[in-house]
């Protein structure tokens, strides 16, 4: 058993049929010595008396808010949560496996630049009685500071018969140099509590590996005389690291109709303009990627050919 | 401790091409190592990230773009002194700071070159003959060093009398290649910045 935060404790249980469970001793936070009784949640049934209460925690029915009273007055609370371990593996029931970039990916993180700011998000089908707490650091043995905000519900989607909820959090490394060469990864830890179930999820990454630039901005077309070719130009996204001659991007320019199966024109360039063939009912799209370290491509920025 | 804007005229910077070749060669070699050594811990997640140039050179700090010198987090640099002549400078108005930057890059390359050559000698003794260093990568390191053209003491190639542990050598190769790729990215960024300035 360990303390998650003040008056909230996590009991780690091996979860299998007829498991013996964990013996837990609760102590009432009071100078009083006698006349103390214990109850669980909203029940008025007295579970025991005295300054300490010993319980055997085996299942969710044994978890909850234990309260010690004296003469009708509440003295203190202890909330017990369960963390299940099945076949030596901690449960991952609360969050959905996003399976990208590999199986057992529950947290996904992206950074728009090298400033040390990044966003992580996760998915769940649970809509109520759900809380998240996020901590982060650079390295684990001698951790350096990363400050994370509160996790917020950022999107709701309908997937078949189920609703899916996306939560996200923004974090900022306390003293980040955009030009630094990372040797210690960023560690992100998410505590998830659903009703009386506790789970924790972790992700470890280098900022350089989670870079995904914003789409290029200000796409413009200039038709070339006596030709089907058009010159398309664009600019670096505002959120990208500066100076751009140091943090350079490379671009992919594509002309395509509405269907992905349609024919297309595609060209890669390090410049902020390119010449392509425009077709009726097609769109010109441009996306960006770090020129020197191939992490993710940005989303497409698009303009219609016409 | 930074690169000023008064740098060589555009198109007068011969090292850019070599640095692009370097990054390409290292990336290819790392990819080959990851494929060939698929049953060894050779991915970015599996290896320890070590920098053999730590406390010996300070390329990131010495080559910091002017725009980032306002960022205090970028300025906790180590003081290192370097030789200050080199052909990539290509301009009389080149500053001392830039010479410091380029000589730091040269020292990085020299250190990695020695490590790679020592390691290749060990790998050539491996009866499995599983992996060797790409001669193209070694040649590209050499070309960039020649383009930088700094005078520097020769670092003797390390020789070891004991029987090499090939498993450890291959893991060290992975560690070295990952670190060198990261440094090659920095070198490419620096050369691009200097070329554009």
């Amino acid at each position: 058993i360990w303390e998650l935060k003040k008056d909230v404790y996590v009991v780690e249980l091996d979860w299998y049929p007829d498991a013996p469970g964990e013996m837990v001793v609760l102590t009432c936070d009071t100078p009083e010595e006698d006349g103390i009784t214990w109850t669980l949640d909203q029940s008025s049934e007295v579970l025991g008396s005295g300054k300490t209460l010993t319980i055997q925690v085996k299942e969710f029915g044994d978890a909850g808010q234990y309260t010690c009273h004296k003469g009708g007055e509440v003295l203190s609370h202890s909330l017990l949560l369960l963390h299940k371990k099945e076949d030596g593996i901690w449960s991952t029931d609360i969050l959905k496996d996003q399976k990208e970039p590999k199986n057992k990916t529950f947290l996904r993180c992206e950074a728009k630049n090298y400033s040390g700011r990044f966003t992580c998000w996760w998915l769940t089908t649970i809509s109520t009685d759900l809380t998240f707490s996020v901590k982060s650091s650079r390295g684990s043995s001698d951790p350096q500071g990363v400050t994370c905000g509160a996790a917020t519900l950022s999107a709701e989607r309908v997937r078949g018969d189920n609703k899916e909820y996306e939560y996200s959090v923004e974090c900022q490394e306390d003293s980040a140099c955009p030009a630094a060469e990372e040797s210690l990864p960023i560690e992100v830890m998410v505590d998830a509590v659903h009703k009386l179930k506790y789970e924790n999820y972790t992700s470890s990454f280098f900022i350089r590996d989670i870079i995904k630039p914003d789409p290029p901005k200000n796409l413009q077309l200039k038709p070339l005389k006596n030709s089907r070719q058009v010159e398309v130009s664009w600019e670096y996204p505002d959120t990208w690291s500066t100076p751009h001659s140091y943090f350079s991007l490379t671009f992919c320019v594509q002309v395509q109709g509405k269907s992905k199966r349609e024919k297309k024109d595609r060209v890669f360039t390090d410049k902020t303009s390119a010449t392509v063939i425009c077709r009726k009912n097609a769109s010109i799209s441009v996306r960006a990627q770090d020129r020197y370290y191939s992490s993710s491509w940005s989303e497409w920025a698009s303009v219609p050919c016409s | 401790r930074n690169l000023p804007v008064a740098t060589p005229d555009p198109g007068m910077f011969p090292c850019l091409h070599h640095s692009q070749n370097l990054l390409r060669a290292v990336s290819n070699m790392l990819q080959k190592a990851r494929q060939t050594l698929e049953f060894y811990p050779c991915t970015s997640e599996e290896i320890d990230h070590e920098d053999i140039t730590k406390d010996k050179t300070s390329t990131v700090e010495a080559c910091l773009p002017l725009e980032l010198t306002k960022n205090e987090s970028c300025l906790n640099s180590r003081e290192t002194s370097f030789i200050t002549n080199g052909s990539c400078l290509a301009s009389r108005k080149t500053s001392f700071m830039m010479a410091l930057c380029l000589s730091s890059i040269y020292e990085d390359l020299k250190m990695y070159q020695v490590e790679f050559k020592t390691m290749n000698a060990k790998l050539l003794m491996d009866p499995k003959r599983q992996i060797f260093l790409d001669q193209n990568m070694l040649a590209v390191i050499d070309e960039l060093m020649q383009a930088l053209n700094f005078n520097s003491e020769t670092v003797p190639q390390k020789s070891s009398l004991e029987e090499p542990d090939f498993y450890k050598t291959k893991i060290k190769l992975c560690i070295l290649l990952h670190a060198f790729r990261i440094r090659a990215v920095t070198i490419d960024r620096v050369m691009s910045y200097l070329n554009a300035s």
Epitope: R228, K263, K264, F268, T269, D270, R279 | -
Partner: antibody, heavy 118, light 107 residues
Framework: QVQLVQSGAEVKKPGSSVKVSCKAS????????LHWVRQAPGQGLEWMGW????????EYAPKFQGRVTITADESTSTAYMELSSLRSEDTAVYMC???????????WGQGTLVTVSS | DIVMTQSPLSLPVTPGEPASISCRAS??????LHWYQQKPGQAARLLIA???QSISGVPSRFSGSGSGTDFTLTISSLQPEDFATYYC?????????FGQGTKVEIK
């Protein structure tokens, strides 16, 4: 299986024209760009131009502009390349090639030898 | 026009040995570079697109690398069926242009 089958060899006099055909099978004809590339004896490959069979749009290499015409007949899934004012240096194998991507070629025809000789 | 220069023009190789063909562009073409194999009397075959993207159905012994002006096609271990002429082609700008070709011959 996508295939491009070209017409047979031709012998032409200088100053005349030649029209080579390229019949496509497998896949929808108008879903692909169609290009013509030639190879003179002992020489490398030379791109001549492309057509979008869907709308008849064409683009030609400046070297052939005014002498080459590329057309396409959707009903027969056939593309044609006509080269006029033939000279002896036009003696070459003419190949058609296609792809959904405009700028490179994933399927090639077997080639048609055109000999220009007086 | 962008001029593509291949080297060597002839490459004698022992079967089972690796082979590398170089292609250089007269100006930077990013990764807009494709490789083809051609055998006498046969249709050409696309091997690699955009400098390093492998093509479905092409054996994994063929790989490509490079960007900017310098590109390489590598055959890790030459098989008897690989003796042919190889061409690079740039797609950075029109007109599309090819290298002169490299003939890989049995040593």
């Amino acid at each position: 299986q996508v295939q491009l089958v070209q017409s047979g060899a031709e012998v032409k006099k200088p100053g005349s024209s030649v029209k080579v055909s390229c019949k496509a099978s497998g896949g929808t004809f108008s879903d692909y760009y169609l290009h013509w590339v030639r190879q003179a004896p002992g020489q490398g490959l030379e791109w001549m131009g492309w057509i979008d069979p869907e709308n008849g749009d064409t683009e030609y290499a400046p070297k052939f502009q005014g002498r080459v015409t590329i057309t396409a007949d959707e009903s027969t899934s056939t593309a044609y390349m006509e080269l006029s004012s033939l000279r002896s240096e036009d003696t070459a194998v003419y190949m058609c090639a296609r792809n959904k991507e405009l700028r490179y070629f994933d399927v090639w025809g077997q080639g048609t030898l055109v000999t220009v000789s007086s | 026009d962008i001029v593509m220069t291949q080297s060597p023009l002839s490459l004698p190789v022992t079967p089972g040995e690796p082979a590398s063909i170089s292609c250089r562009a007269s100006q930077s073409i990013s990764i807009n570079l494709h490789w083809y194999q051609q055998k006498p009397g046969q249709a050409a075959r696309l091997l690699i697109a955009f400098a390093s993207q492998s093509i479905s159905g092409v054996p994994s012994r063929f790989s490509g690398s490079g960007s900017g002006t310098d590109f390489t096609l590598t055959i890790s271990s030459l098989q008897p069926e690989d003796f042919a002429t190889y061409y690079c082609q740039q797609s950075n700008s029109f007109p599309l242009t090819f290298g002169q070709g490299t003939k890989v011959e049995i040593k």
